[in-house]
């Protein structure tokens, strides 16, 4: 393969009503279970069917959640950040981040996704 | 809906390796960890090491420096590269399957274990 991968990364506001089981997603990460090295962030690692996410469709696995009702959640314990989201009311506001892969030609072409220069 | 199926376990001497691999079928989802924990006659379940599917590992300090824990995401399945193994090694190894928290109404870990396998260092 003599293609590069790239990653276009954009946010977005999720305004999610808590269902009877809950916001209906999952989530690993933390300052002390690190997902990706040197990244304490909080990433969505399953969606559940018929949830409040996954009825939403907005939200995808992988996702990055930068904050919940306006609370950062950077460099938090995971089970602080569990608990952020067990006290964040009914209706929740996440900031995501969503990380989309994206193939780029051979490599040397500089597409428009390269950050260098 | 997950199944994890251990091998690689034994008996062997002090100071030897083995190596343990776990496979992975189901639904595991591309966003988990994968690892090997261990309980030793009479004592509690212990984390060995763990890595996930973003690239992180982490090690009990037990083994730091003696084990080596791999993954292919492709084959969905975890490694756990064991040397310079001593007595005190000695358990059941098993591995897990963590798919994260689930934010729901139990707020419980969303995880799978496989049956086990027995390491023995004499």
């Known amino acids: 393969m003599n293609g590069r991968v790239d990653y276009l990364v954009t946010e977005e506001e999720i305004n999610l009503t808590r269902g009877p089981s809950g916001l209906g997603f999952n989530i690993v990460g933390g300052t002390d279970q690190q997902y990706v090295s040197n990244d304490s962030g909080i990433y969505v690692s399953r969606i559940k069917e018929n949830g409040a996410a996954a009825l939403d469709g907005r939200l995808q696995e992988g996702d990055k959640i930068l904050s919940v009702n306006g609370q950062d959640l950077k460099n938090l314990l995971h089970q602080d950040a569990v608990d952020l989201f067990r006290n964040a009311g009914y209706a929740v506001s996440l900031r995501v981040q969503h990380r989309l892969q994206v193939q780029n030609g051979p490599i040397g072409h500089r597409g428009e996704g390269d950050p260098s220069g | 809906e997950v199944q994890l199926v251990e091998s690689g376990g034994g008996l062997v001497q002090a100071g030897g390796s083995l190596r343990l691999s776990c496979a992975a079928s189901?639904?595991?989802?591309?966003?988990?960890?994968m690892g090997w924990y261990r309980q030793a006659p009479g004592k509690q379940r212990e984390l060995v090491a763990s890595?996930?599917?973003?690239?992180?590992?982490n090690y009990a300090d037990s083994v730091k420096g003696r084990f080596t824990i791999s993954r292919d995401n492709a084959k969905n399945a975890v490694y756990l590269q064991m040397n310079s193994l001593k007595p005190e090694d000695t358990a059941v190894y098993y591995c897990?399957?963590?798919?994260?928290?689930?934010?729901?109404?139990?707020?419980?870990?969303?995880?799978?274990w496989g049956r086990g396998t027995q390491v023995t260092v004499s």
């Open positions: 897990n399957l963590d798919r994260g928290t689930h934010l729901g109404d139990s707020f419980e870990r969303d995880d799978y």
């Open positions: 189901g639904s595991i989802g591309s966003i988990n960890i």
């Open positions: 890595i996930t599917s973003g690239g992180a590992t």
